[in-house]
């Protein structure tokens, strides 16, 4: 059988080989499609209810004015020419519909490195056969279940038209230190060959690098945190993340009532300033991160400064924020 591919809604003409070009003709068409059970016979003489779907033209060809999904199947013509020679034509008709350009909906503007993120949902409407959706990163195909990539797919069929709607939700786990502006796109590949893929417009979410806890560095001057009475201690909270987070300070696990600042200065140290200090970096996009704690202690003249002083009183003494 000769394979014929026809677009849904378009007309189709199937030639009856060997048929006389005009009546009288001895020919018959046989159809076995979604509209028939077994075979339906159509002849040049018989105009009727089937004419809206398929009718025999004066030249013996079969004319389908608007091909539908139910017209998929086998079409056969048997014709006899003026000399009594019989010729058979055999067609296998498959139909297709190209959907509208796929779109990425619910797309993320920002992804977080190191954790799974929903990038977006690719939607294609009105295809037949269903076809497939695939995702691309920087122009290269993304393989599901590899390197933190997962895809959730859904296929629905319109109850009246029989056309398909495809949905594909992409989840990725961006690597730390990777591309800060990856380019994602999605493409629809038709279920029938010889039709090119349709690609969405690309999306370029930003990748945000969360600052791990150990990266919130607390630097103490003098080193070790041991200082003579009346001396000055400078605590600096270093956070490499951009944009700069808000820094708050804690003493002995209690927030200090001070405005946010990356530097805390303790001038004229007294016993009440002794204790354990830490800083807390608060990012707009996720929760707070606390630094390691350091002990501030007073050493009497002649003593060796300990690396970790004992916890002192709870008084704040005099604090200065840089």
């Amino acid at each position: 059988a000769q394979n014929i591919t026809a677009r849904i809604g378009e007309p189709l003409v199937l030639k009856c080989k060997g048929a006389p070009k005009k009546p009288p003709q001895r020919l018959e068409w046989k159809l076995n499609t979604g509209r028939t059970e077994a075979w339906k016979v159509l002849s040049p003489q018989g105009g009727g209810p089937w004419d809206s779907v398929a009718r025999v033209l004066p030249n013996g060809s079969l004319f389908l004015p608007a091909v539908g999904i139910q017209d998929e199947g086998i079409f056969r013509c048997q014709a006899m020419n003026r000399n009594g020679k019989e010729t058979k034509s055999n067609y296998r008709v498959r139909v297709y519909q190209i959907p509208g350009k796929p779109e990425i909906v619910d797309s993320a503007s920002e992804l977080t490195a190191g954790v799974p993120n929903k990038v977006g949902t690719c939607v294609s409407e009105g295809s037949y056969p269903a076809g497939t959706l695939s995702w691309h990163l920087d122009g290269k195909p993304l393989v599901p279940n590899e390197k933190g990539v997962s895809v959730k797919e859904q296929t629905r069929r319109h109850p009246e038209t029989g056309l398909f709607t495809l949905q594909s939700e992409l989840m990725v786990t961006p690597a730390r230190g990777g591309d800060p502006r990856p380019t994602f796109s999605c493409s629809f590949s038709p279920g029938l060959p010889r039709h090119r893929a349709l690609r969405t417009a690309p999306i370029q979410p930003r990748v945000w690098e969360p600052v791990p806890l150990e990266e919130v560095q607390l630097v103490v001057e003098p080193e070790g945190g041991a200082v003579a009475p009346g001396g000055t201690v400078t605590l600096t909270c270093e956070v490499p993340a951009q944009p700069s987070p808000q820094i708050h300070w804690m003493k002995d696990g209690v927030p200090l009532p001070l405005p946010p600042s990356p530097v805390l200065i303790l001038p004229e140290i007294g016993p009440q300033d002794q204790g354990t200090y830490s800083c807390v970096a608060t990012h707009s996009s996720h929760g707070p991160q606390e630094s390691r704690a350091v002990s501030i202690s007073i050493i009497e003249p002649g003593e060796e400064g300990p690396t970790a002083g004992s916890v002192g009183g709870s008084g704040l003494g005099t604090l200065a924020l840089a």
């Epitope: 509209r35 339906k40 209810p49 809206s52 779907v53």
Partner: antibody, heavy 119, light 107 residues
């Protein structure tokens, strides 16, 4: 609301002519074949004529062929039945109905119009 | 031409009864048979299309089935409003042919 309304029925003498009309509303008229069906008093239903959506092809049973003509005006959403050489046996209620092909067959009907052929 | 032989031509039944009406086509018409209900002085109303499909707004007590060239309309539990005349229609070929009708009366 999908609606079909027939008009034009009445009393006519044998050999006379009558033109029936059917006004369609509530659907895209030129997407559908249309059909006339009749019912003689106390009898069953009988197909009279069908026309395809463009109006290019018309279909009749032998009982009315060459006497009746079905036509349509898609711009006016109207279906017509021109009846000539009327006989007593044409007396019936005439219904217009949507469809008539294998895709849609007589899913919506008008209320009917009575044609009486009598001297 | 295709003949549609409908039986019975009339039947008497009571509310709640199961009623079956059949049409036999004289040749293969595929699935292209409809069933209609008609009440006195009213236009026919399509109940079943393409042999087995329930038309919009039709109660589920109506159903259609097909076995070869035999087509059946079943009313599972007859209701007072179901007393009417029922017709089958073949629309696979011209001339379109109706069955002779079945009048369902109150017993």
């Amino acid at each position: 609301e999908v609606q079909l309304v027939e008009s034009g029925g009445g009393l006519v003498q044998p050999g006379g002519s009558l033109r029936l009309s059917c006004a369609a509303s509530g659907f895209t008229f030129n997407n559908y074949w249309m059909t006339w069906v009749r019912q003689a008093p106390g009898k069953g239903l009988e197909w009279v004529a069908s026309i395809d959506n463009s109006g290019d092809n018309t279909y009749y049973p032998d009982s009315v062929k060459d006497r009746f003509t079905i036509s349509r005006d898609n711009a006016k959403n109207s279906l017509y039945l021109q009846m000539n050489s009327l006989r007593a046996e044409d007396t019936a209620v005439y219904y217009c109905a949507r469809g008539g092909d294998i895709l849609v067959s007589l899913d919506v009907w008008g209320q009917g119009t009575l044609v009486t052929v009598s001297s | 031409d295709i003949q549609m032989t409908q039986s019975p031509s009339s039947l008497s039944a009571s509310v709640g009864d199961r009623v079956t009406i059949t049409c036999r086509a004289s040749q293969d018409v595929g699935i292209y048979v409809n069933w209609f209900q008609q009440k006195p002085g009213k236009a026919p109303r399509r109940l079943i299309y393409r042999a087995t499909n329930l038309a919009d707004g039709v109660p589920s007590r109506f159903s259609g089935s097909r076995s070869g060239t035999d087509f059946t309309l079943t009313i599972s539990s007859l209701q007072p409003e179901d007393f009417a005349t029922y017709y089958c229609l073949e629309f696979d070929e011209h001339p379109l042919t109706f069955g002779g009708g079945t009048k369902v009366e109150i017993k």
